[in-house]
């Protein structure tokens, strides 16, 4: 679809003369029609294919016309098509005398015909006009011609149809030619396909208009390049959604179980040495001068009595010091300087010469001991602590401290490692002699029913078009993660691409 | 050749949500070169575009609805579905689903037969 | 809003052209569709982007649009083309249909 467009310049008549070379009464009052039509190597008459069109009466005899685009659009002369524009064309312009104001051809005589002249030839689409001048013996007309497109047609013969649009069905622009040219941030045949943000992952983003990035399930980020881990992870990472892949130290399946106690919470205290032992559990080797299970108690080194023969202790910082009783010296005061004549055995201890009497020993009564029976027997010398107890004596009593898993006065009673619910998952728990068991439900396994092992929902392979399947470990099923080109719970569905123009 | 059909409850009460699936068959609902709408003909009246949208789950509303319409897609299933809220008398009418081609400039090439829903207590 | 204005009703005799305008604000630059549908029946896709015909559709039906005109063209009328016709173009990001016109 287009339009010829006929831009008369001036017409010269200067003898105002018909063609008959009659002059016109009292002059040439001149209109003219123009016929468009296919090309004939010689133009003839015949029907005006490509279109009609008469002007009013421009002017007497010899005038120059006006353009009057602007108001009314009489000229240029518009000769509008509804076809592809062929390239060539057939052009009759007659010059009519109009004696009165009826301009049809019936109501004029036939000799009111002033001149006609007929060209032939090509004509490409264009804005430039062409200038033309045709010259007869008694007139002259000069006049300028153009093919245009119609509003919405391009190309080279205006059969292009293309309406600029920005709406989900394109955001487009037309070229010269009639292709489409995408508005900024907007791609594809129709100009419908937004660009996503820059570095938006392929795969795993999409987006709905320009520089958005959208994350398919199990990934997430500005740009989508970021995976979802197992929901509940702790201190563990993913490289593919829904993993939880356990940072050092920790264990389990979230990630939450603490495999590395020692470092993350230093439990020993003064100086002592921590090791790892299991799942949140840990031994301390104290440095000398502490007890505990942490170390945190500081051992005095006069609790174990090292002075003999009524010898008093007293702590220091590198260890401790005997005063001893008179006749008695030595690191612990066991050497004596009394005879049994000195009555150095107290508390109802009998003496006895030794080496001629150069020495004694005493024989104490129950519940005395020592050198010189000036102990009271120490409750713990007959170990009465049970399953490896350390046994304190404190004054004129003694205390048992009990090692993990016992209990009682003695550290008789054995503690059930059940009694904390170690089996995780359900698992029944079972106290042993030196620990415990745990027997797990379908779908557990582990020392404590920590690992599940139910069915993988992988293993039937359930993407289509070489997906990646991931199992969704807190409800048993999978997500699978498309590759360009498909969509779908199962990748099942391929992106069509768009046909091409029907033009 | 593709099919689509519509299935939902034919008589919704005043001031409830109207629930309206499209099931596409004989082709994907994920290609790229269609939107999927929803239109709708009261008895005796004219057409009336409801919304549409993309496989992407993009949406676009008949401003004179939008407040009281959702419209979503299942690619797992290929349908897509309408939700009107708050329905009247005013909102009796048939309603199709149509596959609206970007290469037809956004024209419907393919109509469901269209399913009567009358909003009445 | 957007509207779209069609004639009620065109009558036409078996054999003659029918016309059916539809008339919108610079309609000429929007792309328009036409919808054939008879009583009963689902609408039928016969003109898009003013003057394609989909595949099926008879060379009889044609359009054109320019200006605030749209048209839809039945050459040689035949009884079977007695139906309901609407226009249909796109506001921004809005369909817009129109009133119709009963072709009998």
């Known amino acids: 679809s287009g339009v010829f467009q006929l831009q008369l310049q001036e017409f010269i008549n200067e003898r105002g003369v018909l063609a008959s070379g009659r002059p016109c009464e009292p002059g040439c009052r001149t209109f003219f029609r123009v016929c468009l039509k296919h090309f004939q190597a010689v133009v003839s008459p015949g029907p005006c294919t490509f279109g009609t069109v008469s002007t009013p009466v421009l002017g007497t005899n010899s005038f120059a016309v006006r353009d009057d685009s602007s108001g009314g659009g009489r000229n240029p002369l518009q000769l509008p098509f509804n076809f592809t524009w062929p390239g060539t064309f057939s052009l009759i312009i007659e010059a009519w005398h109009a004696p009165g104001d009826d301009l049809r051809p019936e109501a004029l005589p036939p000799d009111a015909l002033i001149s006609k002249i007929a060209i032939q030839g090509s004509l490409a689409v264009g804005q430039n006009w062409l200038l033309d001048e045709q010259t007869s013996t008694l007139t002259r007309l000069r006049y300028s011609y153009r093919v245009i497109c119609s509003d919405n047609y391009y190309g080279d013969n205006c059969s292009r149809l293309c309406k600029k649009r920005n709406d989900h069905f394109g955001h487009y622009v037309c070229q010269p030619d009639g292709n489409l040219s995408c508005l900024p941030g907007w791609t594809g045949e129709y100009c419908q396909q937004p660009i996503c943000l820059s570095g938006c992952h392929e795969q795993n983003g999409y987006c709905s208009k320009p520089a958005e990035c959208l994350c398919r399930p199990g990934w997430q980020g500005r740009l989508c390049n970021e995976c979802i881990p197992h929901n509940g992870c702790r201190h563990g990472t993913c490289s593919t959604p829904w993993q939880c892949t356990c940072d050092e130290g920790w264990g389990g399946l979230f990630c939450d179980q603490d495999l590395n106690y020692c470092t993350h919470h230093s439990p020993c205290k003064n100086g002592a040495t921590c090791s790892n032992s299991g799942q949140r559990s840990y031994t301390c080797t104290c440095r000398p001068g502490y007890t505990g299970v942490d170390c945190e108690l500081e051992l005095s080194e006069c609790d174990s009595n090292p002075c003999r023969n009524g010898g008093s202790c007293k702590d220091q910082e590198d260890g401790y010091h005997c005063l001893c009783p008179p006749g008695y010296y030595g690191l612990h005061c066991e050497h004596s300087t009394l005879s049994c004549a000195d009555s150095p055995c107290f508390n109802g201890g009998s003496c006895r010469e030794r080496n001629q009497g150069a020495n004694y020993a005493c024989e104490c009564p129950p519940n005395f001991t020592g050198s010189n029976c000036e102990k009271k027997v120490d409750r713990c010398t007959s170990n009465p602590c049970a399953n490896g107890g350390q046994c304190l004596n404190r004054g004129p009593s003694r205390m048992c401290r009990c090692r993990p898993g016992f209990t009682g006065t003695y550290c008789e009673l054995h503690v059930s490692d059940c009694a904390r619910n170690p089996c995780a998952h359900g698992g029944t728990c079972h106290d042993l002699e030196n620990g415990l068991m745990c027997t797990c439900p379908a779908g557990f396994s582990g020392r404590r029913c920590e690992v599940r092992t139910s069915i993988d929902a992988c293993a039937s392979s359930p993407c289509f078009n070489r997906a990646t399947c991931y199992t969704d470990l807190s409800t048993d099923t999978f997500v699978c993660n498309c590759p360009y080109g498909f969509v779908g719970s199962r990748c099942e569905f391929p992106v069509g691409l768009p046909p091409s123009f029907p033009w | 050749e593709v099919q689509l059909q519509e299935s939902g409850p034919g008589l919704v009460k005043p001031s409830e949500t109207l629930s309206l699936t499209c099931t596409v068959s004989g082709g994907s609902i994920s290609s790229g070169s269609y939107y999927w709408g929803w239109i709708r003909q009261p008895p005796g009246k004219g057409l009336e575009w409801i919304g549409d949208i993309y496989y992407t789950g993009s949406t676009y509303y008949n401003p004179s609805l939008k407040s009281r319409v959702t419209i979503s897609v299942d690619t797992s299933k290929n349908q897509f579905s309408l939700k009107l809220s708050s329905v009247t008398a005013a909102d009796t009418a048939v309603y199709y689903c149509?596959?609206?081609?970007?290469?037809?400039?956004?024209?419907?090439?393919?109509w469901g037969q269209g399913t009567l829903v009358t909003v009445s207590s | 809003s957007y509207e779209l204005t069609q004639p009620p009703s065109v009558s036409v005799s078996p054999g003659q052209t029918a016309s059916i305008t539809c008339s919108g604000d610079s309609l000429g630059d929007k792309y328009v569709s036409w919808y054939q549908q008879k009583p009963g029946q689902s609408p039928v896709l016969v003109i898009y982007?003013?003057?394609e015909r989909p595949s099926g559709i008879p060379e009889r039906f044609s359009g054109s649009n320019s200006g605030d005109t749209a048209t839809l063209t039945i050459s040689g009328t035949q009884a079977m083309d007695e139906a309901d016709y609407y226009c249909q173009a796109w506001d921004s990001e809005t369909g817009v249909f129109g009133s119709g016109t009963k072709v009998t």
């Open positions: 982007e003013d003057s």
């Open positions: 149509a596959r609206q081609a970007v290469m037809y400039g956004g024209g419907s090439d393919n």
